[in-house]
Interface confidence: low
Amino acid sequence: SIQGTSLLTQSPASLSTYNDQSVSFVLENGCYVINVDDSGKDQEQDQVLLRYYESPCPASQSGDGVDGKKLMVNMSPIKDTDIWLHANDKDYSVELQRGDVSPPEQAFFVLHKKSSDFVSFECKNLPGTYIGVKDNQLALVEEKDESCNNIMFKLSKINPAFLYKVVGAADYKDDDDKAAHHHHHHHHHH
């Protein structure tokens, strides 16, 4: 666990977009880059390791969770789990970073269940900002319309019973007030 979050479980999954494009991780010049592209039917999809966390604090963001507690995830390529999917709030890019300390706040995403098939990932450090698809790349998207297709992702090869248990029933609908985003406060420990 880290900074007030407790690890529920971790599980591998492949990540694809609303339009069935695959999210893959390619090593180029010693660094991983993230690709979003069509994968052949017989092609093995890259997998991510998703770590699911439950925060003990009441949600300041409208994440789906258990007993009013928000559910957060962070993600690593299954082939290198010391690298984290990272929401860079300086240039609004989504990138893979290897950190010498535990993953920064930018590596945590509040999980929203959009339907029985789709989820979205809201940046913990940037409420109202989601991982989205722009020009065949992942980017940070400020999305007022939470039903927008480009922030919806499908997680496959994941235990559906677990997903159902922690994020609620498939026909779950966000309440209007739950969908409103509140200002996120940093907590200091001095």
Partner: antibody, heavy 117, light 108 residues
């Protein structure tokens, strides 16, 4: 209140070994990344090593790689730095620090390591 | 290896404004954090994430960022602000932390 108390510093000959300890209190030690940062006399700060709660990952500055080993005992709330093959240039005050997300929010008072014959 | 560059020293009269710069190629993408160190003491955080001020730090301390340079500004400098100041950030890959060389602020 977060407290980090280093110990184990002292005078050692070149090529010798030393083990530093950092006793942590006032927070859930097992939940935080911890590091050692050093400062040679009259010089600037240098990041040395880090230990994360994630899969027990450890990281080292190039200057100490292969000679220093960071470890932690979560049951004792203690961080360690085993220093082998010490050199004169390792002479410094060694600080135990706690990370809060991407920055250091708490520092110990430091322990002096002197490598000299 | 990655380098963060700071001026070695800055001198300022009481009540004036001190500006300390920190330059590094990765700073458009990586946050910088600032630490104050007084003689014989451990460093203490004064600014994090380029511009954020921790609770307990006086309002006269502020941070800004532009391109490859971040700046720590001390407005209305007081005698107690005399100290060494260090910026810290990550290398371009995010793989390790780097400190700047430090800037000694002298209050005249």
């Amino acid at each position: 209140e977060v407290q980090l108390l280093e110990s184990g510093g002292g005078l050692v000959q070149p090529g010798g070994s030393l083990r530093l300890s950092c006793a942590a209190s006032g927070f859930t030690f097992s939940s935080y990344a911890m590091s050692w940062v050093r400062q040679a006399p009259g010089k600037g700060l240098e990041w040395v090593s880090a230990s994360t709660p994630w899969q027990g990952s450890t990281y080292y500055a190039d200057s100490v790689k292969g000679r220093f080993t960071i470890s932690r005992d979560n049951s004792k709330n203690t961080l360690y730095l085993q220093m082998n093959s010490l050199r004169a240039e390792d002479t410094a005050v060694y600080y135990c620090v706690r990370w809060y997300w991407g920055w250091i929010d708490s520092w110990g008072r430091g322990t002096l390591v002197t490598v000299s014959s | 290896s990655y380098v963060l560059t700071q001026p070695p020293s800055v001198s300022v009269s009481p009540g004036q404004t001190a500006r300390i710069t920190c330059s590094g190629d990765a700073l458009p993408k990586q946050y910088a954090h600032w630490y104050q160190q007084k003689p014989g003491q451990a460093p203490a955080l004064v600014i994090y994430k380029d511009t954020e001020r921790p609770s307990g730090i006086p309002e006269r301390f502020s941070g800004s960022s532009s391109g490859t340079t971040v700046t720590l500004t001390i407005s209305g400098v007081q005698a107690e602000d005399e100290a060494d100041y260090y910026c810290m950030s990550s290398d371009p890959s995010g793989a390790s932390r780097v400190f700047g060389g430090g800037t000694k602020v002298t209050v005249l």
